[in-house]
């Protein structure tokens, strides 16, 4: 697996991250991995539509190290990570990187290899046990069976690590057998099967909503005593935590 060239880290204050771009906005504890099929089963123009879908989804997520962390991987016979879960960059910068994922147009896109990469590289160590872990597998092709030898092992390995796998089959060549096998492994592994990339936009909100519903809301922030706000009621001293209650999703 190869990684994208490292650019200087942009530090920013997470609490003053960029404002929501849409009414629908997912503010949950979530580690989300986008896996993009880099095979020639998608034309270069179709791959651009696929990337636009990923960017559109990212716009609807509260991306930060505290809320929704994202990773973006293009897969062919190997895997190329463009964004890692721990990358501390502004959401707009992450979206820009996602929009610049290169079209591989390879003969093979190995779902087994990218799930292995997800299992052993991305989720090798669970550093945010309180967050949901979801992999969105965008697949438009079929790998040779010999490459699929350990497919079920990797799907089961992800299940053991509580990683939900959501396959999105795109077009006539998507491997329906693998999609059904993923679904069979866990009830949360819901599949979306689309006839072409043109249907991605129609399904986007349903997919984001489904992902978001699987993730927990953040617990109310606990503050040290000196940060507490004293409220006086009739004949009663009370303590409440600062800050408004955060809604998980604004529709």
């Amino acid at each position: 697996p190869t990684d994208a060239p490292v650019s200087p880290t942009t530090l920013y204050v997470e609490d003053i991250s960029e404002p929501p771009l849409h009414d629908f906005y997912c503010s949950r504890l979530l580690d989300l991995v986008f896996l993009l099929d880099g095979s020639s089963r998608l034309s270069e123009a179709e791959f651009e539509v696929l990337k636009a879908f990923v960017v559109d989804m990212m716009e609807r997520l509260r991306i930060s190290q505290k809320w929704v962390r994202v990773a973006v991987v293009e897969y062919h016979d190997g895997s190329h990570a463009y964004i890692g879960l721990k990358d501390r960059k502004r959401p707009s910068e992450l979206r820009r990187i996602a929009s610049q994922v290169k079209y591989a147009g390879s003969q093979v896109a190995s779902t087994s290899e990218v799930l292995k990469y997800t299992l052993f590289q991305i989720f090798s160590k669970i550093d945010r046990p309180e967050a949901s872990r979801i992999t969105l597998l965008l697949m438009a092709s079929q790998e040779p069976q010999r490459m699929s030898r350990n497919f079920v092992r990797y799907v089961q390995g992800l299940k053991k690590k509580k990683v939900i796998v959501i396959p999105v089959g795109i077009g006539p060549h998507a491997n329906l057998k693998q999609i059904r096998l993923i679904e069979k492994q866990a009830p949360e592994n819901k599949a979306f099967v689309l006839s072409s990339v043109d249907e991605l936009e129609q399904q986007r909100d349903e997919i984001v909503s489904y992902l978001c519903d699987l993730a927990p809301e953040a617990p109310p922030p606990t503050l040290p005593p000196d940060m507490a706000q004293v409220t006086v009621g009739p004949g009663l001293l009370g303590v409440s935590t600062l800050g408004p209650k955060r809604n998980s999703m604004v529709l």
């Epitope: 087994s112 069976q145 010999r146 490459m147 699929s148 350990n150 079920v152 057998k177």
Partner: antibody, heavy 122, light 107 residues
Framework: QVQLQESGPGLVKPSETLSLTCTVS????????VDWIRQPPGKGLEWIGM???????DYNSALKSRVTISVDTSKNQFSLKLSSVTAADTAVYYC????????????????WGQGTLVTVSS | DIQMTQSPSSLSASVGDRVTITCSAS??????LNWYQQKPGKAPKLLIY???SLHSGVPSRFSGSGSGTDFTLTISSLQPEDFATYYC?????????FGQGTKVEIK
């Protein structure tokens, strides 16, 4: 019922190519793989390679440069070709069915042909 | 390649005996191990797959156990038709590899 039968010449000259055929019945060629295994006289089993239901292949690295496994679905036949043979290739050659299906990761050779003895000698 | 080592290479036993054959892998193979039985002049037959799952039609006197690198095939009460050579085979990593075999002979 599931059946596999190997056929081919029993005698091959050194440096020539050994060619065997495995004719199968009772199962779908796209749902199963077929493996080739050999057993030199009085010795143990050696895996040669396999062909998957979609025609993709895997070979034993020790034999890879000399082996070709292919399928003719219209005849329900699998073939093994081993080039540049020497006396060390003398063995009983078996073909066996492999549930080579990523929905089932138990890759066990559940049905075997009866085997065919190939002697390499001039 | 993963090396598979069986022990003993041969053993003598009587009908009714409990027989144990061990198989050791050169590296961790999880539970990805099969056992085959071969009689002289015949093709091997699958007995047990995935360490302990009995193949259809195989008598319940055969059982398998183990995980990682060490595995066992047990015949609880040896029958006359069980005199044969037994092979273990790993399928954790290609190429599939077999043990050298254990010959079970009549005492």
């Amino acid at each position: 019922q599931v059946q596999l039968q190997e056929s081919g010449p029993g005698l091959v000259k050194p440096s020539e190519t050994l060619s065997l055929t495995c004719t199968v019945s009772g199962f779908s060629l796209t749902d199963y793989g077929v493996d080739w295994i050999r057993q030199p006289p009085g010795k143990g089993l050696e895996w040669i390679g396999m062909i998957w239901g979609d025609g993709s292949t895997d070979y034993n690295s020790a034999l890879k440069s000399r082996v070709t496994i292919s399928v003719d679905t219209s005849k329900n036949q699998f073939s093994l070709k081993l080039s540049s043979v020497t006396a060390a290739d003398t063995a009983v050659y078996y073909c066996a069915r492999d549930p080579a299906d990523y929905g089932n990761y138990d890759y066990a050779l559940d049905y075997w042909g009866q085997g065919t003895l190939v002697t390499v000698s001039s | 390649d993963i090396q598979m080592t069986q022990s003993p290479s041969s053993l003598s036993a009587s009908v009714g005996d409990r027989v144990t054959i061990t198989c050791s892998a050169s590296q961790d193979i999880n539970k990805y191990l099969n056992w085959y039985q071969q009689k002289p002049g015949k093709a091997p037959k699958l007995l047990i797959y995935y360490t302990s799952s009995l193949h259809s039609g195989v008598p319940s006197r055969f059982s398998g156990s183990g995980s990682g690198t060490d595995f066992t095939l047990t015949i609880s009460s040896l029958q006359p038709e069980d005199f044969a050579t037994y092979y273990c085979q790993q399928y954790e990593k290609l190429p599939w590899t077999f043990g050298q075999g254990t010959k079970v002979e009549i005492k």
